[in-house]
């Protein structure tokens, strides 16, 4: 049957109508009208947005359309005391310093309440030291330095370029190492793109220009000051030293121009190879500290940020379901920006903005979904994802029992080469079928469907004639959603090609520059990404919303469990002897996900013959479904990490950004032949093996006949 | 279109002052670092001072550290030199210049004033 | 401190290849600006950062750096490229700069 047949409308309000609704000027509109000022977390511009886009939700026909509202801890640099770095001589004089503040882009000289750059959270204070460079201070970097290179960073403050990894895991490898400071910087080799200009003239990033971002380590925790629970009016709330995921350490970012002042006299050791080499003409000497002529020179830094507990606000925005109103589907993005947030998060914000008017629309002529919509307009994002998660934590118990799923929508563009899907395995089926119907943007593809062309920029490591998906990670609104509450959840956005630019991220990310201009000008002038990106996130809400039998196939999570069983049991081999004196078996996990396969095959088969007609049957097939991402979450949560929960994917240990899959058994086994009880290292491994054997199984049975 | 004016050179006796004015105009003054350049008749070049974009740096040259300061107004798109206790070796045609990238002040000069002559004599 | 050499005087015919050097202990390590003068005229940047041309200067000028020499190229020279050259370092030593005596090109 259609989903139509289900709420009793006419067929004109299908996934077509909703689909052609939506209109590039319109996207394009809404994203110069949310760019045009600063929105920071936490400012009256903000609330002042957040209020706007209420009348507006309302305006477009939504049921109701709340603001929620949290007191959580933010960070912002002092307005009369500013940070900055020196180099100083033996006299203690500054001889050089870096810049206050990014040269503003043309157009916007007169635009107050900037930020200027800083690390949000870092803690004040004036450390002088050596400077020791550190590279991409990886988890691997500081291995380089201090096992192979044998150098001590105990007491120097450390620079690292700025990409492959969160900044956050940046400042606690920095931490572990004993640094005592951190800076951060943007090297042109990962920031800007041969061929391009910069900034006003091109998409790169120029000297000037500088990505700011917070330093926090929170592990899925939210406000700082209340983890597990909302920032409420009657919260009770850790005092600072208690809080959680804080820098212990000042930390400060800064653009090329000043780095190479910094590291052009830096001596030392050579770099270790040429993998530790930017592009700035520079020798990228390790150090400790600098060359012949200036080894008294010292660096200092100037850090005098303060950490607040400010109000953030949430827009809520409902859909009623017509038939299952106690199901949920969440369509959100953040609204808060460092600067004017042209890509990030605007180009999010301006798409669900026309993803919600088009859904009115539809409402207005008679049409509802089946289930229940949520949309919302996160705050605080840009500082640890608080207001989402502090939204789920008031919520969570609603969530955990009604929520279908989470479609996240950040940033719609990073580039604009092809489409990047992340999701759980339960939404590919899902991506696969809409991207087959929906036209391709690109140049060459023209009359091709958006899977084709997709598929064939973007082809998949494992199936041919397939698109690659990857897995979910964090350091976005999702991460509650999924990683902590289990509900199903993905994301998708316009990608660069990864193959030929190498830089991270995009050049212009958080800084000044990241205008409407630059989307206007340089990314997409005709909006057709933007629309393609609006098509993809507002048809899988559609189908979510609307379908009779949830989009959802459980033997694809049969198929990448296998592929992550047998990944994890290659790490663990590297390890033979090991394995065997302390009898480590994978042969639970291997059965457990056996089992798994053959339970979701039939389930499968049940899916397609049971009688649609009966909705008890259909309800309890569904719930099923729904629950089944809500089945691989362990109450206890991974070791040391206990809001992520998930035991399929957590974000790497190693860099937020990225999903490591079968966390807990990987983080076991990580550097295991450093450990000093290598007996206690392998006993972690068998009981981390135990758990994920469980947890599949367990999840399996919710797959079974229930009677 | 992106120019440099210099103004407020003269005939000037030792040891007396004299402040130069460079106006900015066809670009956002504020995000480049600006240099003063002199070149005495019949000379090479030489370089005189620099002021990074937001002044958080200013360097000068040796011969004339301590008697010249380098200053700007962003509110008149203005760069200053002010000249103190000066010498007959500082007579010269002083030159304004721009550095090419916004927000450096170390590159090179891909704008250059006319010039203004300042001639130190009893 | 830091200093750049430059020969006095270069003479080319016409249609030739003038070359002018600026040499300075590990100047490859730095990055290079070259500028014209002519008589009477304010100094006009014609190779930066090594080799990179701005806009409204001819492919004919280039420029290299490696070792301790600079080298501004002038291909198929003309009559007007008659001027002085100069070649300036930001030297990081010293936070100055610095300019080469300067080169006069004379088209013969």
């Known amino acids: 049957k259609s989903s139509n047949e289900a709420t009793n409308i006419t067929p004109k309000h299908n996934m077509k109508a909703f689909l052609d609704e939506l209109k590039a000027e319109n996207i394009k509109k809404f994203l110069y009208n949310f760019t045009q000022i600063p929105h920071l977390a936490g400012t009256e511009q903000n609330f002042q947005l957040a209020k706007q886009i209420q009348s507006q939700w309302k305006e477009f026909g939504l049921d109701s359309v709340e603001l929620a509202h949290y007191d959580v801890l933010l960070s912002y640099p002092n307005k009369t005391h500013p940070n900055y770095i020196s180099i100083i001589n033996e006299d203690g004089n500054e001889i050089f310093n870096t810049s206050l503040f990014e040269p503003p882009p043309p157009g916007y000289e007169n635009v107050s309440d900037i930020v200027p750059p800083f690390s949000a959270f870092s803690p004040q204070g004036m450390p002088e030291g050596d400077l020791v460079y550190v590279n991409y201070a990886r988890t691997e970097d500081f291995f380089k330095l201090e096992r192979d290179m044998k150098i001590n960073c105990s007491g120097k403050i450390v620079i690292a370029r700025y990409g492959k990894v969160f900044r956050g895991n940046k400042v606690k490898n920095a931490q572990l190492a004993g640094a005592k400071g951190v800076i951060l910087y943007s090297d042109p080799a990962d920031y800007f793109a041969p061929g391009v200009k910069s900034y006003p003239d091109g998409w790169n990033l120029p000297g000037g220009g500088v990505q700011r971002g917070n330093i926090l380590n929170l592990n899925g925790a939210g406000d700082p000051l209340t983890p597990g629970y909302p920032a409420n009016e009657y919260a009770y709330r850790r005092g600072i030293a208690e809080a959680v995921g804080l820098p212990s350490i000042p930390v400060h970012p800064i653009g090329y121009y000043d780095a190479q002042k910094l590291l052009e006299k830096m001596g030392g050791s050579a770099p270790p190879d040429s993998s530790w080499r930017g592009s700035l003409k520079v020798p990228y000497n390790v150090g400790p500290g600098f060359t012949g002529n200036f080894s008294t020179q010292k660096v200092k830094m100037h850090i005098h940020s303060t950490n607040e507990v400010t109000r953030i606000y949430n827009v809520i925005g409902t859909l009623r379901g017509a038939v299952e109103p106690d199901r949920y589907v969440i369509l959100g993005g953040h609204r808060d920006s460092w600067v004017f947030g042209g890509i990030d998060p605007q180009s999010g914000a301006a798409v669900v903005h026309e993803i919600v008017r088009s859904f009115g629309t539809l409402k207005k002529e008679g049409w509802r979904p089946r289930r229940t919509i949520l949309f919302a307009s996160w705050d605080a994002e840009e500082f640890g994802l608080l207001g989402s998660t502090e939204w789920a934590e008031e919520n969570s118990r609603l969530l955990q029992e009604r929520g279908v799923a989470y479609i996240n929508a950040d940033s719609s563009i990073e580039g604009n080469y092809t489409l990047r899907v992340d999701c759980t395995p339960l939404m590919y089926s899902l991506v696969h079928n809409l991207t087959k119907e929906l036209k391709s943007p690109d140049e060459g593809f023209e009359g091709k469907s958006l899977y084709e062309s997709w598929t064939k920029k973007s082809p998949s490591p494992e199936f041919s004639g397939m698109p690659r998906i990857s897995k979910l990670g964090s350091g976005n609104d999702f991460e509650v959603f999924f990683q902590r509450l289990g509900i199903a959840s993905g994301r998708a956005r316009y990608t660069k090609n990864w193959e030929t630019n190498k830089f991270s991220g995009y050049p212009l990310y958080h800084s000044v520059y990241e205008t409407y201009e630059l989307v206007e000008k340089f990314y997409d002038p005709m909006f057709k990404y933007h629309l393609t990106v609006a098509q993809v996130r507002g048809g899988m809400v559609f189908e979510l919303a609307n379908s009779i039998v949830l989009p959802f196939d459980c033997r694809d999570y049969a198929v990448v469990l296998r592929k992550y069983a047998d990944k994890i049991y290659s790490i663990s081999m590297k390890h033979p002897q090991e394995m065997k004196t302390y009898s480590v078996s994978f042969d639970s996990l291997f059965s457990a996900v056996k089992n798994f396969t053959e339970i979701a095959s039939k389930f499968s088969e049940r899916l397609q013959d049971f009688d649609k007609s009966n909705p008890i049957v259909l309800r309890m097939m569904n719930d099923q479904l729904m629950f089944l991402e809500r089945a691989f979450i362990d109450p206890l949560g991974l070791p040391d990490r206990p809001f992520y929960r998930h035991v399929i994917y957590a974000p790497s240990s190693h860099n937020k950004y990225a999903g490591e899959s079968f966390p807990g058994i990987y983080d076991a086994l990580f550097d295991i032949e450093s450990k000093v009880d290598p007996s206690k290292a392998w006993g972690e491994v068998k009981r981390q093996i135990y758990v994920a054997a469980f947890t599949v199984q367990a999840a399996a049975e919710t797959l079974s006949e229930v009677a | 279109e992106v120019q440099l004016v210099e103004s407020g050179g003269g005939v000037v006796q030792p040891g007396r002052s004299l402040r130069l004015s460079c106006a900015a105009s066809?670009?956002?003054?504020?995000?480049?670092?600006m240099n003063w350049v002199r070149q005495a008749p019949g000379k090479g070049l030489e370089w005189v001072a620099v002021?990074?974009?937001?002044?958080?740096?200013?360097y000068y040259a040796d011969s004339v550290k301590g008697r010249f300061t380098i200053s700007r107004d962003i509110s008149k798109n203005t760069l200053y030199l002010q000249m103190s206790s000066l010498r007959a070796e500082d007579t010269a045609v002083y030159y304004c210049?721009?550095?090419?990238?916004?927000?450096?002040?170390?590159?090179?000069?891909?704008?250059w004033g006319p010039g203004t002559m300042v001639t130190v004599s009893s | 401190s830091y200093e750049l050499t430059q020969p006095p005087s270069v003479s080319v015919a016409p249609g030739q290849t003038a070359r002018i050097t600026c040499g300075g202990n590990?100047?490859?390590?730095?990055?290079v600006h070259w500028y014209q003068q002519k008589p009477g005229q304010a100094p006009v940047l014609v190779v930066y950062?090594?080799?990179d041309r701005p806009s409204g200067i001819p492919e004919r000028f280039s420029g290299s750096n490696s070792g301790n020499t600079a080298t501004l190229t002038i291909s198929r020279v003309e009559a007007g490229d008659e001027a002085d050259y100069y070649c300036?370092?930001?030297?990081?030593?010293?936070?100055?700069?610095?300019f080469g005596g300067g080169t006069k090109l004379t088209v013969l």
């Open positions: 950062d090594d080799s």
């Open positions: 066809g670009f956002t003054f504020s995000s480049y670092g």
């Open positions: 590990n100047i490859g390590s730095k990055s």
């Open positions: 002021t990074s974009y937001d002044e958080s740096n200013k």
């Open positions: 300036q370092v930001w030297d990081s030593s010293t936070d100055h700069v610095v």
């Open positions: 210049a721009r550095d090419p990238y916004s927000s450096s002040w170390n590159g090179a000069f891909d704008i």
